[in-house]
């Protein structure tokens, strides 16, 4: 922690300027008034402070705003943002997308995924929902950041905004996030024709239920293997060999390459070997001929 000393009269600070780079840490602590610093935050980023000096300035702001910085200060943090922890950011109330853009630019190239995720979360809370302007800002300045949001936050995305989301924005989304986004996408794109619909819905299909995947198999969509591999295991297991063949079309040959990987491996184990043989791919591990298949999940549900 910085020692408290009194400020020498000749070192008194009346404005934030480049002369401060020559101040030692304890002089900055003693001579910079926190209220002055907050009022002139827009000047700080233009001054080549050392990281140690930035620590002092952060300490001053923390003392002045123990409940969290106001947005007027947050907007001008610049490289001081690199000093913020997720705990600091959690105290903020951010509504301006200009603030978000400024801080996303600063964070680029630095390992700040936790801080950025918390910042985006605060913006969504501050704005009340994940609206189109926010999504546009995220996709432009922080590809992949959409997936840093919790499923609870993503649930505030209106379906009308889904069209602004690009495939690469979903690359890092997990199943729980896609579970939230997929039904919104299905609603948003439902007025499109079959082929156009499939192109749009494809990046979201990791959240699709079995019946939607079955429906797609009737549409001659020729799903690529990469998309098939991202389908949830539970959505793939009930599909028949014929349905998978129709779903993948010419890409069905790719099943051989993915034979040992989930969900293909798990799906193979559920199929009759006779049925798998009809594909002519040499897939092995199906249920041998003559064996009886009991669907215990349905039996349990009925009991």
């Amino acid at each position: 922690d910085v020692e408290r000393t009194t400020c020498p009269p000749e070192k008194e600070v009346h404005e934030i300027d480049e002369s401060l780079i020559f101040y030692k840490k304890r002089e900055l602590e003693a001579c910079v008034d926190a209220a002055l610093l907050a009022a002139q935050m827009d000047r700080v980023d233009a001054i080549p402070f050392t990281y140690e000096q930035l620590d002092v300035l952060k300490h001053k702001l923390d003392e002045l705003y123990p409940q969290g910085y106001p947005e007027s200060v947050i907007r001008h943090l610049g490289h001081l943002f690199l000093k913020m922890s997720p705990e600091d950011i959690r105290k903020w109330n951010v509504t301006s997308l200009e603030t978000l853009k400024a801080l996303l630019k600063v964070s680029k190239g630095h390992e700040m995924s936790a801080q950025v995720a918390t910042l985006i979360d605060r913006v969504v809370v501050g704005r009340g929902q994940l609206d189109k302007d926010t999504v546009d800002t995220l996709t432009a300045f922080c590809p992949g950041c959409l997936c840093s949001l919790s499923p609870e936050r993503l649930s505030s995305v209106p379906p009308s905004v889904i069209g602004a989301v690009r495939p690469q924005d979903l690359d890092t989304c997990g199943p729980r996030q896609l579970d939230v986004l997929y039904p919104k996408a299905r609603l948003a794109f439902q007025n499109m024709s079959g082929s156009e619909y499939f192109v749009k819905i494809r990046p979201f299909l990791g959240g699709a239920p079995t019946e939607d995947v079955k429906a797609l198999s009737q549409q001659n969509v020729s799903m690529d293997l990469a998309t098939f591999m991202k389908l949830r295991r539970e959505a793939v297991l009930p599909l028949t060999v014929a349905e998978v063949q129709k779903l993948l079309g010419p890409h069905v040959e790719g099943l051989k390459v993915e034979e040992q990987h989930s969900p293909v491996r798990d799906w193979i184990l559920k199929q009759r070997q006779d049925d798998l043989d009809t594909l002519g791919l040499g897939l092995q591990g199906g249920i041998p001929n003559g064996y009886l298949i009991l669907d215990l999940s349905v039996r349990e549900a009925l009991s």
Epitope: P175, D179, G194, T210, A215, E234
Partner: antibody, heavy 122, light 107 residues
């Protein structure tokens, strides 16, 4: 074939929480989206919200602050909790299955439970 | 939210005649509209989806038309089992909303 059955108390006191369960039999709960819809006596239908087996939900904004929809895949059941009830929440509550077997599926219902009347009264 | 308005509230028609029920949306719902039939003490039954596609097992006398904001359900030749309450429902956006219903009664 798949059947739905609602269960829960038929009488709830004002300010308390209404709790209902829908049991899905004859098929897996994992294949579809599942909704709650209610109908006050002599009135029209109101969609409450849906749930996916993973727990992902969407609720009607008019009720959102009071609604919790949850799922128990091991029992093939999903549930509704509606807090701080008043007489205006007296209705027949239906669970329903959202259709998924259509090329570009829509949010409408091809299978319904028989419904259960819940009366809010002290 | 999208408000669905049905008219008339009650429609009296003789068996064998044609019945025409209307549903209007407060904003465009494209063709994302379903019709249901409900008899006393029973759950609703899906009749039509996509504004004009009959659900599985629904007789050909039921037909739907319209798009945007104006929709019609037509029953070409009323049978005794058709007298019930009919609801329209939009699924163009959340929250999903229903009309207040049209009661079809025997004249």
């Amino acid at each position: 074939q798949v059947q739905l059955q609602e269960s829960g108390p038929g009488l709830v006191k004002p300010s308390e929480t209404l709790s209902l369960t829908c049991t899905v039999s004859g098929g897996s709960i994992q294949n579809y989206y599942w909704s709650w819809v209610r109908q006050p006596p002599g009135k029209g239908l109101e969609w409450i919200g849906y749930i996916f087996y993973s727990g992902s939900t969407q609720s009607n904004p008019s009720l959102k602050s009071r609604v919790i929809i949850s799922v128990d895949t091991s029992k093939n059941q999903f549930s509704l909790k509606l807090s701080s009830v008043t007489a205006a929440d007296t209705a027949v509550y239906y669970c329903a299955r959202e259709v998924g077997r259509i090329a570009v599926a829509g949010w409408f219902f091809d299978l319904w439970g028989r419904g259960t009347l819940v009366t809010v009264s002290s | 939210e999208i408000v669905m308005t049905q008219s008339p509230a009650t429609l009296s028609v003789s068996p064998g005649e044609r019945a025409t029920l209307s549903c209007r949306a407060s904003q465009s719902v494209n063709s994302n509209l379903a019709w249901y039939q409900q008899k006393p003490g029973q759950a609703p039954r899906l009749l039509i989806y996509g504004a004009s596609t009959r659900a599985t097992g629904i007789p050909a006398r039921f037909s739907g038309s319209g798009s945007g904001t104006e929709f019609t359900l037509t029953i070409s030749s009323l049978q005794s089992e058709d007298f019930a309450v009919y609801y329209c429902q939009q699924y163009n956006n959340w929250p999903l909303t229903f009309g207040q219903g049209t009661r079809l009664e025997i004249k």
